[in-house]
């Protein structure tokens, strides 16, 4: 029974997207009165794990020495104090990459594009998948997330960009996934560098490091344009 105790804080170290085989630590932080910590994983018998608190008792560590498919999923944690169990933490979604072979990322008509023109990034998988993600290198979130309408399996997804500006320049990768577990992603594609050359009206600025797509309205690199791609995939913002 969840009591009036404040909910604990749950996070993953080094972060919540982990490559297959790499280590990750899940931390649950409660209060100094905590006597025990419990970690629950969605769709697994509860509790998934229990740990005694580390001194000074306000934190517990759940170690995953080698990431596999079994660990990917949605977690919540609780702590027990002398007055009962806490409310659940906010969920932690632990994603594993490397579950499937890497897709291929290409640019049509070319990765060299003039500012103001259009380009489409094409992510292709060898086996049919129903979800494709596009990321800009070192960005904290996928730029676009394409999922098929009715779970239909696709070999590719198109990510149109129009009109292209200097902000679109940079290195991109894509991932593919099956809808039955969006916590399992493929290996990343090889990187694709998109080079945007300036026009007379839009001189190319000096190169800068790629920035997160959430940098502000003027820095949003991928505004969805045009109709739904021919692949039959629906476009979603992450």
């Amino acid at each position: 029974q969840a009591g009036p105790l404040p909910k604990p804080t749950l996070w993953a170290e080094p972060g919540s997207v982990i490559s297959w085989g790499n280590s990750v630590t899940i931390w649950c932080q409660g209060t100094l009165e905590a006597r025990e910590y419990r970690l629950d994983k969605e769709e697994s018998p509860a509790p998934w794990d229990r740990q005694n608190p580390l001194e000074p008792k306000n934190k517990a560590r759940f170690s995953i020495p080698s990431m596999t498919e079994d660990y990917a999923g949605r977690y919540r944690c609780y702590y027990r104090s002398p007055v009962g169990w806490s409310q659940p933490s906010d969920p932690l979604e632990l994603v594993m990459t490397g579950a499937y072979s890497k897709p291929t990322l290409s640019a049509l008509p070319s990765p060299l594009v003039t500012s103001g023109k259009s380009v489409t990034l094409l992510c292709q998988s060898r086996s049919p998948m129903d979800t494709f993600l596009l990321i800009k290198e070192r960005a904290a979130h996928p730029l676009l997330h394409l999922r098929s309408e009715h779970g239909a399996q696709q070999h590719q997804a198109e990510f149109p960009m129009s009109p292209v500006t200097s902000v679109h320049g940079g290195t991109y990768r894509c991932f593919s996934s099956h809808g039955f577990s969006h916590y399992l992603l493929s290996h990343p594609s090889d990187p694709l560098e998109l080079i945007v050359s300036g026009s007379l009206e839009d001189p190319r600025p000096s190169p800068t490091r790629s920035v997160s797509t959430a940098a502000g309205p003027e820095d949003q690199p991928l505004m969805p344009t045009g109709s739904v791609p021919h692949s039959g995939l629906r476009r979603h913002w992450e």
């Epitope: 790499n22 070192r138 940098a215």
Partner: antibody, heavy 123, light 108 residues
Framework: EVQLQQSGPELVKPGASVKISCKAS????????MDWVKQSHGKSLEWIGY????????GYNQKFNSKATLTVDKSSSTAYMELHSLTSEDSAVYYC????????????????WGQGTSVTVSS | QIVLTQSPAIMSASLGERVTMTCTAS???????LHWYQQKPGSSPKLWIY???NLASGVPARFSGSGSGTSYSLTISSMEAEDAATYYC?????????FGGGTKLEIK
Amino acid sequence: EVQLQQSGPELVKPGASVKISCKASGYTFTDYNMDWVKQSHGKSLEWIGYIYPNNGGTGYNQKFNSKATLTVDKSSSTAYMELHSLTSEDSAVYYCASSPYYDYVGSYAMDYWGQGTSVTVSS
Amino acid sequence: QIVLTQSPAIMSASLGERVTMTCTASSSVSSSYLHWYQQKPGSSPKLWIYSTSNLASGVPARFSGSGSGTSYSLTISSMEAEDAATYYCHQYHRSPRTFGGGTKLEIK
């Protein structure tokens, strides 16, 4: 453009405390861990710890457990590090650096660094 | 904690020369979590190579990185004046994050 702007140099007396700030701009503050790194004069880099601004989760190098306290103010996208009971050994340049919490390539490298804050402990 | 040992501590190279520096870990490190930073005097470190072999944005193609397990290296195919700096390797395979002692690269 991503920027981490740190507070200015500090001259403090032994035994005192100091609080350094690091204001982030150009990205979503809560999507990146903020790490803190120490560099003594002419020496290598030492990791102090991190804070995950989204929920305040922290991890420390045990060596700095009782030396440093990391906090954030989400409303101003600012991270803070307070150093306690300062001695001459704490004289150094301190950097904040951000690493993505959702790193799809899985590297968790420190992408962006502040310009550094020099702390001098002297009586 | 994982100790990273860089060698040599100081090296000098002529312009156009091929340069290799190494980073040896006291225990095995995932290649995903091994990075290199460049630092010039009076400046902050910059991410230079991440996950062993990926060049950070803006890093010239003459740089490359390789390795696995306990042995990693950074190579410059043809030394240029702007490459003179200190290079640090860094791991986050296991907490605490640790850095190597650095290799200072000078122009001969």
